[in-house]
């Protein structure tokens, strides 16, 4: 039950995270005009990964796409790539995790297959979250660098008679959405990986069968147990770990994987 809850919660958290990564990638407010210590202008500038926008005080908003690939800064291209990779991995992870959910039955899929799929999706979510966090952090670093450069220009470039309004940009809402979304996807991925451990089927344990060889005695115990010499030490079958499986000594009615819908 705890495994199913962990897996389900991991899926939901990752789903929210990936939706957030998609939203952040599409948002126009990755960087917004810094209003502090600036002349009060009747326009407000903000920029995204795909276009830059200007909102006039009159309410008119104009956005222009970056219709060039080669003319864009390498860092912006890198951020775009990281976010897209994050979305693609996250989307594949979501697809895989749907089939891996313990509460969903698909044919006669083994628990081992579900465990593997859960682990795969978990890893994908972790990488997706890391890509988003990395992308947003690279952009934030780029903003900080440019901010201080333009601040320096504001105080050194006043030699001429005519003043130019230096537009400085600061963190936009998309950065915070991206960080939170990346973090959620990462957490969801970790939860899926944890759930995978609980889903992994235990090795089938059988009653010990002793094979008497001439010379010295060797007790061979199938089911993953070490063979032990002599008869006295390990004749009672022991479990490697208590994962819900029962030995033949503990036979009782136990729901099979096909009883779950």
């Amino acid at each position: 039950m705890a495994v199913t809850a962990c897996q389900g919660l991991g899926f939901v958290v990752s789903l929210i995270g990936i939706a957030g990564i998609i939203a952040a990638t599409c948002m126009d407010q990755w960087s917004t005009q810094d209003l502090y210590n600036n002349p009060v202008t009747a326009v407000f500038n903000y920029q995204g990964l795909w276009r830059s926008c200007v909102r006039e005080s009159s309410g008119f908003t104009e956005c222009r796409g970056y219709f060039t690939l080669l003319g864009l800064p390498a860092m912006l291209q890198a951020v775009r790539a990281l976010m897209i990779v994050g979305i693609v991995l996250g989307a594949i992870g979501l697809l895989v995790s749907i089939f891996a959910l313990k509460c969903i039955r698909i044919g006669s899929m083994e628990d081992s297959a579900k465990a593997n799929m859960t682990l795969t999706s978990g890893i994908m979510f972790i990488v997706s979250g890391l890509c988003a966090i990395a992308g947003v952090s690279v952009f934030a670093n780029m903003l900080v660098t440019n901010f201080w450069m333009s601040t320096a220009n504001m105080y050194t470039g006043m030699g001429g008679m005519v003043q130019t309004v230096q537009t400085r940009y600061t963190f936009g809402a998309a950065l915070f959405v991206g960080w939170v979304a990346g973090g959620l996807t990462l957490i969801g991925g970790v939860m899926m990986c944890i759930a995978c451990r609980g889903l992994a089927p235990e090795e089938t344990n059988y009653k010990a069968v002793s094979y008497h060889a001439s010379g010295h005695s060797v007790a061979y115990k199938p089911g993953g147990f070490k063979a032990s010499t002599g008869f006295g030490s390990n004749t009672k079958n022991k479990k490697i770990y208590d994962g819900g499986a029962r030995t033949e000594d503990e036979v009782q009615s136990y729901p099979s994987k096909h009883d779950y819908v």
């Epitope: 202008t41 006039e56 309410g59 008119f60």
Partner: antibody, heavy 117, light 113 residues
């Protein structure tokens, strides 16, 4: 059809306060900003202030302490309130709608204000 | 505050003549975000309120004849009337629409010879 019309007291005594209303039709005040501009007799245009669609205001720095621009709840009227009037506040007062480029695309006919004792 | 300086203060012309008037601002009116200059030109005829002619320094408002052309960038702007008509006799004002307060120039009066 966009229309703006100013209505004021016409004459005010010095040191008194003034309230001019601008009644608009053909557009919503929740979508457009309205500016106030005045023109003293035989002189040029002087920008007084603006109330934007969201309700935020900006004023001329010299008149900021004496000016208040507001909108009424029915959203069809804009008010200009001005305190401590002097004779040099005598002018034609215009209200105008803001459009692209923060430009003033539609103007009222103006209301003449005379400050004299 | 941004100071808008218009020149000449008055201009006497004959019908059909090409006219240019200048407007200079004390600060750049160019917005780097969209590369637009936030300068507007108005025409005011006697006894009438001003009329919008040109915004974004070069975009004609609807209904404005194409003989009116706005040009310039940053701090230096020009309004050109390619062939002056009798109905163009008026005072022309430029306005800063970029940095508050949104100041006007003193105006250029266009008169007929």
């Amino acid at each position: 059809q966009v229309q703006l019309k100013e209505s004021g007291p016409g004459q005010v005594a010095p040191s008194q306060s003034l309230s001019i209303a601008c009644t608009v039709s053909g557009f919503s005040l929740s979508s457009y900003g309205v500016h106030w501009v005045r023109q003293p007799p035989g002189k040029g245009l002087e920008w007084l202030g603006v109330i934007w669609a969201g309700g935020s205001t900006n004023y001329d720095s010299a008149l900021m302490s004496r000016l208040t621009i507001s909108k009424d709840n029915s959203r069809t009227r804009v008010f200009l309130k001005m305190n401590s009037l002097q004779t040099d506040d005598t002018a034609i007062y215009y209200c105008a709608r803001s459009l692209y480029g923060n430009s003033l695309d539609s103007w009222g006919p103006g209301t003449t204000l005379t400050v004299s004792s | 505050d941004i100071v808008m300086t218009q020149s000449p203060s008055s201009l006497t012309v004959t019908a059909g003549e090409k006219v240019t008037m200048s407007c200079k601002s004390s600060q750049s009116l160019l917005n780097s975000g969209n590369q637009r200059n936030y300068l507007t030109w108005y025409q005011q005829k006697p006894g009438q309120p001003p009329r919008l002619l040109i915004y974004w320094s070069s975009t004609r408002d609807s209904g404005v004849p194409d003989r009116f052309t706005g040009s310039g960038s940053r701090t230096d702007f020009t309004l050109t009337i390619s062939s002056v008509q009798a109905e163009d006799l008026a005072v022309y004002y430029c306005q800063n629409n970029f940095i508050y307060p949104l100041t006007f120039g003193a105006g250029t009066k266009l008169e007929l010879k």
